[in-house]
């Protein structure tokens, strides 16, 4: 017979967990003993089953773990794992601090969408990567010309909405342009908005004429000469 002991104490060295609100937290207390010990959890010294917690908790006894998803400020506290068997018991305290993030305008990854050059008839993907605490919505816009002008009397550009979606729908951050033609050339804007405000970045698509397959086949190396 053997009292409980920690099997991976090096994985338990991080005592203080300071986590942004909305993130997932996982506490682990991997242990062993003979007989095999049981694990239970306390929050601030009281038995913790997560029944009062929105979203509940996940206890994975075989992994000696406690998982809380989408943490909120009320989850702050001291979490104790109590591991015991008939021979003895051990405990370990984790401290959880939940950091309240300030919701901000969407942040767009620098350099996206990127300026792109394509050949007539090819397919193009324009990417836009968005970081936002508040759920963002995205629009892909194409800048267009009306009566020979790109701008209205108010000084703002003429734009056409190509695609609108919320970020959680699939492929919302990618604009697919199939079988591009010369008319597809121009400026494209990825616009992301949330309850705080809007952010947008633009890129240019250049469409080159279709290559002559005969010329390409006859002198392929010519494409790489200066």
């Amino acid at each position: 017979q053997q009292a409980p002991y920690w099997t991976h104490p090096q994985r338990m060295e991080k005592k203080l967990h300071a986590v942004p609100a909305g993130n997932t937290v996982k506490f682990r207390c991997p242990a062993a003993g003979n007989p095999t010990p049981t694990i239970r959890w306390l929050k601030d010294g009281q038995a913790f089953h997560g029944e009062n917690r929105i979203g509940g908790i996940r206890l994975r006894h075989q992994h000696w773990s406690l998982v809380m998803e989408s943490v909120v400020p009320s989850d702050r506290g001291t979490y104790t794992c109590l591991v015991e068997n008939a021979v003895g018991s051990i405990r370990y305290n984790y401290l959880l601090d939940v950091l309240e993030r300030s919701p901000h305008r969407p942040i767009l990854q620098a350099g996206l969408p990127a300026n792109t050059t394509a050949v007539v008839g090819s397919d193009v993907e324009l990417l836009c990567k968005v970081y936002s605490d508040a759920q963002p919505h995205i629009q892909w816009l194409k800048h267009i010309v009306i009566n020979g002008s790109s701008f209205g009397a108010d000084g703002f550009p003429y734009v056409q909405v190509l695609k609108t979606a919320d970020i959680n729908s699939s492929e919302v951050e990618v604009l697919y342009l199939r079988n591009v033609s010369a008319e597809d050339a121009g400026e494209y804007t990825c616009l992301a908005g949330n309850s705080i405000g809007l952010s947008y970045q633009s890129a240019w698509l250049t469409v080159l004429p279709e290559e002559d397959p005969t010329w390409t086949a006859a002198a392929p190396e010519a494409r790489y000469t200066d």
Epitope: P103, L108, F156, P157, N194, L198, Q201
Partner: antibody, heavy 124, light 112 residues
């Protein structure tokens, strides 16, 4: 004409509740986030809360968190602010303000249109 | 929270003379999209605030060109090139980059 018109203000005792409304007209209300901003007598401006265009996201100033609830009814073009457990320090003019829209910003992306405000006085 | 500090508290200006109001933010208001999200308002007696300048230096529609905004990152200035009697009011700067949105304490402009 783009317009925001607040109502529901009045005199109320500390600890009581009040519900403010803001009627929007002249623009597609359901496409804009909306804010409440307040101003205590003789003081500066303080942001209170925001709600996203579809009502799915709401954020509050720490001073009102847990007491005030912002909501909207897009079918009626109406923004609301439910104020519970009112305190003397909540006494202010409450302004309804248009926030960011969903499309390309032809000008500022919000905080361009303000209502005339409604006065809330919390006093015993 | 981002703190907006405005100076001076009040300003008495002779008509036709210039006026300048400063605003400092505790964090940079330059966003990843290259825009600086500081707004300027004037509030005239008994009225709601009116937008003058957005995104650092853009004049809102209908705002006279004697009003201009400038600055970078954390230091911002609103200038009135030639003050007129109708410019009397309290001027506020505001950061519009993250919640809670915050305002400067205000600068009261009066005519000498």
């Amino acid at each position: 004409e783009v317009q925001l018109l607040e109502s529901g203000g009045g005199v109320v005792q500390p600890g009581r509740s009040l519900r403010l409304s803001c009627a929007a007209s002249g623009f597609t209300f359901s496409s804009y986030a909306m804010h409440w901003v307040r101003q205590a007598p003789g003081k500066g401006l303080e942001w209170v809360a925001v709600i996203s265009y579809d009502g799915s996201n709401k954020y509050y100033a720490d001073s009102v968190k847990g007491r005030f609830t912002i909501s909207r009814d897009n079918s009626k073009n109406t923004l609301s602010l439910q104020m519970n457990s009112l305190r003397v320090e909540d006494t202010a003019i409450y302004y309804c303000v248009r926030g960011a829209g969903r499309g390309f910003p032809y000008g500022p992306d919000g905080f361009d249109i303000w209502g005339q405000g409604t006065m809330v006085t919390v006093s015993s | 929270d981002i703190v907006m500090t405005q100076t001076p508290l009040s300003l008495s200006v002779t008509p036709g003379q210039p006026a300048s109001i400063s605003c400092r933010s505790s964090r940079s208001l330059l966003h990843s999209d290259g825009k600086t999200y500081v707004y300027w308002y004037v509030q005239k007696s008994g009225q709601p605030p009116q937008l003058l300048i957005y995104e650092l230096s853009n004049r809102f529609s209908g705002v006279p060109d004697r009003f201009s905004g400038s600055g970078s990152r954390t230091d911002f200035t609103l200038k009135i090139s030639r003050v007129e009697a109708e410019d009397v009011g309290v001027y506020y700067c505001m950061q519009y980059i993250e919640a809670p949105l915050t305002f400067g304490g205000g600068t009261k402009v009066e005519i000498k």
